[in-house]
Interface confidence: medium
């Protein structure tokens, strides 16, 4: 599983006039890290965990980050022309990734009233744009607003992927939390289903880094895939993740099935409660 | 009609702790985006931002001033307070406290003065 | 701390002239830099939020340009009653600081 962060950034234009605040927010691996504070003009921390990643600052370099990239998104926004009356909003979306054979990848997308109109994969400098005209239109704009910018501030995508990508191992390098091995706790339950059946439920929590094997097995075999069902693994909130796996299995055959767990090298078993 | 009043003691002998007060109507600490700052300026001199409470009571101090500082609020009376330990004679200054939503200070008070002497 | 510079200290006009007040941070602070102006024996008065947006009761004389780190301060046509001492804010990064403050003076 990769190491990301991902930027979402949103300004709103109310009457055709560009508002002076904007919205943002910062996940680092999946999980909320960062957002901006409208009100205090502050980036917080998201929870104890983003705290722990940042350390003992005053995270004025996340604020002057997200601030600049508001201010760049707010002129982007006054460059569109089809302001109509009303309120409307652009949205920005950049994602930067490290893999694991230190190979990276970055996107960036737009988005106006919620809809996609405009992608870049920044290491090929491919532009994406969905089929329809509005879409088109946009895309043309902000494209030729972004290319005029760059010029004048001879700036390009790649500098402001080369930036995310800076603060990404930034947060890697510093940070013992995010090269920190926690090891999931386990809980089986079951629940009656049908007569005859019950439904046993495997969930791994509090575990990091995300990538789990969670399976259940019967005689010590995997069971097919398509006879079971899985929970997303979802960040908690606390800067681990969680996920569940469930299977439905006949009344009195529990002692046959286990639910098998992988993590970070680690594995066991854990039996139905009888 | 928004209005801020400080009040405090005048006069103070050095070491002494400064007790400022306040009173604000026409808005609500309890309105989420809410806070009020204190803000002082010594007699012919420049602006000095000193600390700040939130609605949701978190508080923001400027650093080369945070220890001697502590900031309150008591939401239902409307009030702000700012003590500051052990003062000396370079903390002779007009203090303003004043309201701060959107990132500036849109609403002042009419200041109090404060003169520290032995 | 980020660093608030205002320029000149002192500036002296004649009514009816158009002025410009200087103000740079040292380093950027985006557009999240305000205005206000301190009449004598007067509390501070909001005139500018976020370098060039005008503020409800302010006279249209007065108006903000600027971005990053370099930010002015313009009356239009400076009229007698706007002697006083402007001073530009940063509100981008903690702690908030304040300019030392230019003196509009009339001759």
């Known amino acids: 599983e990769p190491h990301s962060l991902r930027y979402n950034l949103t300004v709103l234009s109310w009457d055709g006039s560009v508002q002076s605040g904007f919205l943002a927010e910062v996940h680092l691996d999946g999980q909320p890290f960062l957002r901006y504070d409208r009100q205090k003009c502050r980036a917080k921390p998201q929870g104890q965990w983003a705290e722990d990643v940042l350390g003992n600052k005053t995270w004025d370099r996340e604020t002057r980050d997200l601030t600049g990239n508001g201010k760049d998104l707010r002129m982007t926004l006054a460059h569109i022309k089809d302001q109509k009356e009303g309120l409307h909003s652009l949205q920005e979306i950049r994602v930067c990734e490290i893999h694991e054979d230190n190979s990276t990848r970055s996107s960036q997308h737009f988005y106006y009233d919620g809809e996609l109109f405009l992608s870049q994969n920044v290491e090929t400098e491919e532009w994406t744009v969905p089929q329809s005209s509005r879409a088109q239109t946009l895309a043309m704009n902000v494209r030729n607003f972004l290319k005029e910018d760059a010029m004048k501030t001879k700036t390009h995508y790649h500098a402001m992927h080369a930036d995310c990508l800076q603060e990404l191992r930034r947060y890697l390098e510093s940070s013992v939390v995010l090269r920190r091995r926690v090891p999931p706790m386990v809980n089986v339950t079951r629940s009656e289903a049908s007569e005859g059946n019950i439904t046993v439920t495997c969930r791994a929590s509090s575990f990091y880094p995300r990538n789990i094997t969670l399976t259940w097995r019967q005689d010590g075999v995997s069971l097919s895939h398509d006879t079971q069902q899985w929970g997303d693994v979802l960040p908690d909130g606390n800067g681990t993740y969680q996920t569940w796996v469930a299977t439905r299995i006949c009344q009195g055959e529990e002692q046959r099935f286990t639910c098998y767990m992988e993590h970070s090298g680690n594995h066991s078993t854990h039996p139905v409660p009888s | 009609q928004i209005t801020l009043k400080e009040s405090g003691p005048g006069i103070l002998k050095p070491s002494q702790t400064l007790s400022l007060t306040c009173s604000f109507s026409?808005?609500?600490?309890?309105?989420?985006?809410?806070?009020v700052g204190w803000i002082r300026q010594p007699s012919g001199k420049g602006l000095e931002w000193l600390a700040h409470?939130?609605?949701?009571?978190?508080?923001y101090y400027n650093p080369s001033l945070k220890s001697q500082l502590t900031i309150s609020k008591d939401t239902s009376r409307n009030q702000v307070f700012l003590r500051i330990t052990s003062v000396d004679t370079a903390d002779t200054a007009t203090y303003y406290c004043?309201?701060?939503?959107?990132?500036?200070?849109?609403?002042w008070g009419q200041g109090t003065t404060l003169t520290v002497s032995s | 701390d980020i660093v608030m510079t205002q320029s000149p200290a002192t500036l002296s006009v004649t009514p009816g002239d158009r002025v410009s007040l200087s103000c740079r941070a040292s380093?950027?602070?985006?557009?999240?830099l305000h205005w206000y102006q301190q009449k004598s024996h007067e509390s501070p008065r909001l005139l500018i939020k976020?370098?060039?947006q005008s503020i409800s009761g302010i006279p249209s004389r007065f108006s903000g340009s600027g971005s990053g780190s370099d930010f002015t301060l313009s009356i239009n046509s400076v009229e007698p009653e706007d002697v006083g001492v402007y001073y530009c804010?940063?509100?981008?990064?903690?702690?908030?600081?304040f300019g030392g403050g230019t003196k509009l003076e009339i001759k």
């Open positions: 004043a309201r701060r939503t959107q990132g500036y200070f849109d609403y």
């Open positions: 026409g808005f609500s600490l309890s309105t989420s985006g809410m806070g």
């Open positions: 409470i939130w609605w949701d009571d978190d508080k």
């Open positions: 380093q950027s602070i985006s557009d999240y």
């Open positions: 976020y370098a060039s």
């Open positions: 804010q940063n509100g981008h990064s903690f702690p908030w600081t």
